[in-house]
Structure formats: C-alpha cells, structure tokens
C-alpha cells in the first residue's frame, strides 16, 4: 500500500497561517475570511520513524504539488527548505531523514521537531510577513508551537 | 471499563445553540484521540468533529464547519461539542467516540445523546 | 470524498446460517476498513478494524475480507443476538465515511 497521507492546514499559536511566498518559501501572516484561501494546504505523510503517543514522524507535502519541507546544512545551520522532488516516487513510507519531522503534540501544543537535527523545529516569527523557518530554541521569541486543521482529501 | 458518558442534548429551535458533554473514565483520556458521530433518526452514521489527544489538531466536515467546535478539558476526562446556529438537519443522536484520525476507527462508543432541531 | 456503498440494503436468515455483507468504497482504501454492530437502541460497537483484526471479545464466528476497493463481512454461523444493523467504514483518508448499514433479520 502506498504511505497514508491525510490534508491539513497550520497555525501558529499567534494564529498566523501559513502561505507561499515566492516558488521556494513559505510565510506567517494573519488571514480572515476570504483570504483563508490562500493559506498551504499540506499532504502529511506518516512515515517510518521512531514512535510514540505524542511523537508521530510525518512529512509534510504541499498538496498536489512536487515540493516537501526539508532540512538541511547550509553554511553550517541546520535550515529549512521547499525541496522540489519526483512525484513518481514521492510520498514513500521511508521518506529521506531531511524530510521527516517529528509531530509532537503535548498539551494542547503541536511541534515539529526535524529528525535530521534534533532539537531544530519548524519556527515562526512574532512579526507578521516573515518566512517559516527551522529554529534552534524553544520559548523563545519566535514561535514554535501550532494548532492544525485536517481538511477533506 | 471504559465508560463514555454523553450529556446536554434536548429540543431547540433554529438558529440557538447546544453544548454536549462527554465524561470518559476507565482509560487514559489525555492519550486518546476523540470525536463526535451522530446518527439522523433513521439513517447512517456522520463523523461530525474531530480533537486530538492533547487538543491541537481538530476537524470537521462541510455540513457543521464554523457552526460546531469540539474542545475537551483532559485535567477533567471531558469532551465538548459546542453547536451553534443549528438546523433542522442537525437533528439525531450524537456520540462521543474514542478514536479519529490517527487509527481512524472508533474503538469506543457513548450511550448517545439525543438533539432535536425544530421549531 | 470516498463513498461506501454496502450490499444488501437488508436480508433476512436463520439461526445457523453463514451470513455475508459486502462494501464497495468507491476509491482504493487499502484494507482501511472498519464493522460496526449496532443493536437497536445502542450505539455502535466495533467489530473488525483492518478489514480483518477481529476487536478483543469479538465472537470468532465474525470475519472480514477484502482489499482495494471490495470487502467482506461474514457471520459463519448466525445467533439470535447477532440481529442488528452492521455498517463499514473506512479510514484511508478524511473524511472518514461510513456505508449506509445493513438490517439483518432473522427468518
């Protein structure tokens, strides 16, 4: 059977969606009405890794689109990146370790630890309009909890 | 034993709202996934709402989206449905259900509350 | 979304008979599939998860089948406390849908 991938969308815990910015970047913004349409609706993909109650390992697709978040080095920091890849062979269940994060759910938090560097999760700035980006801290300033929405396939 | 205890249905007219209840003891509420599935009089079954176990993910299907909100209180062993602006379509009983997105079955089924919408 | 259609809508048989349902998804599910029992006036009880893991408790006497898009439910040996109405569902992606249930009857 191919990989299970059910559709979703993202908040941060500011209530900022997510959107694209650009063919490669994703960005946090406040939406309301008619412009919730313009949010990334995600193929998240449960795939091989370790797990438990509140750690599922995920990868997290653009729907209908050949492009999933990754991490990796760039001038030694782990980052994150829009990684365009060969939808004949994409989703799998053995994703690439720079595709695969961890969801970690702990009260009432969503978390998105990336497999590849521990202890790196998917972030957001307070300020409004700023790209999504892999953050080494937490509870800090920037932002790295979410709420999520699962949407019909 | 696992018990899910649904509470709050009743008659209400169009447009009002009603908050369903449901009490979980027997397992480990806070690591379990839950939902709402009502049954019209008559008819099927619909998955109408959708929380994971620590509150952060949620769905809901067409028909009851930015009219119903599922929350759950875990210090509590509680589940929520708050339905707003209802309609006579609303009409049926209404499960909790332990179970959604993740295994996707419902593994654990309430008595069921009844809700009906009519003038 | 994918739809389940479940066949026969009702159908009535004997104590002893081997009883079989089927359920169509009208999109390749995977074996996600779930049986639900439910006796009038109570809520569903799951059955079968996986299109074939029998719940703990279950009677052996209930089994599922399939792959694909096609299942199968069947009671080998029907019981008087087998009268119920029996509905599949799938999983394999949101939402998750149910079929429109089978009423079995005893003749």
């Known amino acids: 059977a191919p990989v299970r991938s059910l559709n979703c969308t993202l908040r941060d815990s500011q209530q900022k969606s997510l959107v694209m910015s650009g063919p490669y970047e994703l960005k946090a913004l406040h939406l309301q009405g008619q412009d919730m349409e313009q949010q990334v609706v995600f193929s998240m993909s449960f795939v091989q890794g370790e797990e438990s109650n509140d750690k599922i390992p995920v990868a997290l697709g653009l729907k209908e689109k050949n492009l999933y978040l990754s991490c990796v080095l760039k001038d030694d920091k782990p980052t994150l990146q829009l990684e365009s890849v060969d939808p004949k062979n994409y989703p799998k269940k053995k994703m690439e370790k720079r595709f695969v994060f961890n969801k970690i759910e702990i009260n009432n938090k969503l978390e998105f630890e990336s497999a590849q560097f521990p202890n790196w999760y998917i972030s957001t700035s307070q300020a409004e309009n700023m790209p999504v980006f892999l953050g080494g801290t937490k509870g800090g300033q920037d932002i790295t909890d979410f709420t999520m929405q699962f949407v019909s396939s | 034993e696992v018990q899910l205890v649904e509470s709050g249905g009743g008659v209400v007219q169009p447009g009002r709202s009603l908050r369903l209840s449901c009490s979980a003891s027997?397992?480990?509420?806070?690591?379990?996934?839950m939902s709402w599935v009502r049954q019209a009089p008559g008819k099927g079954l619909e998955w109408v709402a959708y929380i994971s176990h620590g509150g952060a993910g949620t769905y809901y299907p067409d028909s009851v989206k930015g009219r119903f909100t599922i929350s759950r209180d875990n210090s509590k062993n509680t589940l929520f449905l708050q339905m707003d602006s209802l309609r006579a379509e609303d009409t049926g009983v209404y499960y909790c259900?332990?179970?959604?997105?993740?295994?996707?079955?419902?593994?654990?089924w309430g008595q069921g509350t009844p809700v009906t919408v009519s003038s | 979304d994918i739809q389940m259609t479940q066949s026969p809508s009702s159908l009535s048989a004997s104590v002893g008979d081997r009883v079989t349902i089927t359920c169509r998804a009208s999109g390749n599910i995977y074996g996600w599939l779930a049986w639900y029992q439910q006796t009038p006036g109570k809520a569903p009880k799951l059955l079968i998860y996986q299109a074939k893991t029998l719940m703990d408790g279950v009677p052996s006497r209930f089994s599922g089948s399939g792959s694909g898009t096609d299942y199968t439910f069947t009671i080998s040996s029907l019981q008087p406390e087998d009268i119920a109405t029996y509905y599949c569902q799938h999983f394999w992606n949101i939402p998750a849908t149910f079929g429109q249930g089978t009423k079995l009857q005893i003749t």
């Open positions: 259900a332990r179970g959604g997105v993740y295994k996707g079955y419902f593994d654990e």
């Open positions: 027997g397992f480990i509420f806070s690591k379990y996934d």
